[in-house]
Amino acid sequence: GYKAEVMVSQVYSGSLRVLNRHFSQDLTRRESSAFRSETAKAQKMLKELITSTRLGTYYNSSSVYSFGEGPLTCFFWFILQIPEHRRLMLSPEVVQALLVEELLSTVNSSAAVPYRAEYEVDPEGLVILEASVKDIAALNSTLGCYRYSYVGQGQVLRLKGPDHLASSCLWHLQGPKDLMLKLRLEWTLAECRDRLAMYDVAGPLEKRLITSVYGCSRQEPVVEVLASGAIMAVVWKKGLHSYYDPFVLSVQPVVFQACEVNLTLDNRLDSQGVLSTPYFPSYYSPQTHCSWHLTVPSLDYGLALWFDAYALRRQKYDLPCTQGQWTIQNRRLCGLRILQPYAERIPVVATAGITINFTSQISLTGPGVRVHYGLYNQSDPCPGEFLCSVNGLCVPACDGVKDCPNGLDERNCVCRATFQCKEDSTCISLPKVCDGQPDCLNGSDEEQCQEGVPCGTFTFQCEDRSCVKKPNPQCDGRPDCRDGSDEEHCDCGLQGPSSRIVGGAVSSEGEWPWQASLQVRGRHICGGALIADRWVITAAHCFQEDSMASTVLWTVFLGKVWQNSRWPGEVSFKVSRLLLHPYHEEDSHDYDVALLQLDHPVVRSAAVRPVCLPARSHFFEPGLHCWITGWGALREGGPISNALQKVDVQLIPQDLCSEVYRYQVTPRMLCAGYRKGKKDACQGDSGGPLVCKALSGRWFLAGLVSWGLGCGRPNYFGVYTRITGVISWIQQVVT
């Protein structure tokens, strides 16, 4: 029998340029008579144009929704009802070609053509894009709050905030023809639920979404987004009701930046420069294509690319890369944003050099990509360390911490977290190395203690980049480095003269002079530690709630012992900057560290002094007795303590802790156990210091109270942010 043909709705969106009309401000106001009259005429013209072609039989509906410069640009959508089997044949490209062909056929015609009655349409200015019914619905929902803006060259235009009576608004942005638009979004409130979406076209077409941001993102307080050309749309969706705009938008046209470089690298190891996408740190634009050619001076070297929070992965089944496509020596890789560092190592086999291409394969983009490049020795990529093949990084080997995700850095170790004697490969305790007493059979632990040695896991790196064999030589009163740098920045880690309460849980004034109390509206929220004249360190999770993210809320107290009273030694500060570790992940507690910059420098006293920061190579031995301090709850679920409490704890091997916590313990974490499990850090101690006393009598910061199961529960450990795992970031910020 007869079977009715299935028809489907195909939606197209686009724009056309009218050469004999000029844009006027009236056309930006939908309620104006000029807008109503122009849309009526433009709509009629559009319908006539479509029905003049063989698409006419499929015509369903159309709408002109906006105008722009150029001399006059009309923005529209239309729907065709197409037999299902012809759907693929009428792609946006085919439809555009049919309409252009129609326009061209009538350019020099003297015959009366209905769609040319009023408008001279430029065939070269016609653009047709694929859209959907959902896109049209999204567009229609914004039409009550539709803003068109043209930005001239050299201009920076601040956009008018949304209409808070509307639930959704659209800013339609246009710039000069051969430039690209750069949109800057700055969140101005600590907390909101607003959503903003940026598109690479005039309307909210899902397939041309550049990016969407949501809810006053603290991770990205400022976002800069590049369009591929001179047109862009921004759609706002209301979150919580607010009388204040939670964001500021501004836009400017910028010139296309070439992204092609030819470089010859020097004959030296380590980072030699930076490659980045145009206008970094702006989001890269939807049609970015970068090509970098690097020439390596010798086949002894390989090329290393060090990424920050971005990794390269093999993509299965030729799927498009959603976060940037890379081709390196004909290998296709996809970018992936991660909260970890990553390095790609490229072995060099020919002197011709290496070409690296970066392309944005889809319209959806992301934060600009920056990569440090440099050379590594192909025969020894990580001198004194282990090359982690999973992430391309050099990590300490055999130090008792599985730095490499596959744990291979801790496999096949003769001496793990100990010193290997040359004579017979026996393993001795690290503190016994270079202590003036031979412990190895022939005294190899006491050799080369006064000279530079190759850098390794436990060697200390001096400022001149040479290394010394003695473990933990910092601030011990004896210069071990030729340049004396192991004894610099040593005005730290000394307790004030205090009437120590031996064995007591309550601390006395000056006993822990680096201890900080971080307060909001007079309430102690977290602990912290003074590490420099203007910097206090704490845990990032203290600022997890959006309501806690603003610096203005916080007051930092130093020299404090009692919460309910003040004494002459205590001082308070406001916070001028709050920096969370860029890799901090709330769910896993990884990189749980934050730095607070105080509004003025501290004046050191017996009650206020910084704690010493360990070098990356500092080794805190399992079994070492250390101390945690804080005003945290004295029991699980209890109120905070009035007096500063101190608890001695014992450092625990990483693998044991990892087993107990089902392998959720990362290399940036450190564990400590308590006698009988009754001594523990508890709620309110978060961010507070875990300090260990060196033989010199100075206290070093080993950890920050981070997480754990309850408070002092038997068979569980307290988990701390491992300072040696985040020290490079701390030093980068503080210095």
Partner: antibody, heavy 120, light 107 residues
Framework: EVQLQQSGAELVKPGASVKLSCTAS????????IHWVKERTEQGLEWFGR????????EYAPKFQGKATLTADTSSNTAYLQLSSLTSEDTAVYYC?????????????WGQGTTLTVSS | DIVMTQSHKFMSTSVGDRVSITCKAS??????VAWYQQKPGQSPKLLIY???TRHTGVPDRFTSTGSGTDYALTISSVQAEDLALYYC?????????FGGGTKLEIK
Amino acid sequence: EVQLQQSGAELVKPGASVKLSCTASGFNIKDYYIHWVKERTEQGLEWFGRIDPEDGESEYAPKFQGKATLTADTSSNTAYLQLSSLTSEDTAVYYCTRGDSMMVTYFDYWGQGTTLTVSS
Amino acid sequence: DIVMTQSHKFMSTSVGDRVSITCKASQDVSTAVAWYQQKPGQSPKLLIYWAFTRHTGVPDRFTSTGSGTDYALTISSVQAEDLALYYCQQHYRSPWTFGGGTKLEIK
């Protein structure tokens, strides 16, 4: 000075029960775990179990589960090991020891030991 | 359970000699190893914990080495009073287990 004083030697018949005691001086048992270690001539030292005198919570080595009950009386600073359904396999010296840490347990102080002989 | 193996049941030495008693764990115990000395008719005494840390009052002729699964207790110059039974113990994971013991005898 830290000391652990154990009760005297016991000679008991198979199937009977016995309760050994361990009185601490120089420290408060509430602040530590008290462990029991069994020593037999051929087997060497075997960890038997431990008690937290503060709340009575105890843990036993799997092979001794059901054989013993650990208790403590904090007022007298004393810990007890009760052994039931005795057999010749239970003939041994039993030491009470002090465990210094939560999970990483080594035994810093030991009692003098109680010799238990199970014989008909 | 973690098995601790002391391969030598007996070791002969002379006063003044250096001697090493070895102990092997069935798995990596991350330096969570203690050593005890037991003299005839006495209870064991703690010598070393965390593989390297001497307990209060232990003479410095007693030292220890090791990592991973292999550990050793060394007496740098044996004294007559050191003749005893020596046990290793892992304090890494419950149930806490001891080695079978090594008896140090005079030649």
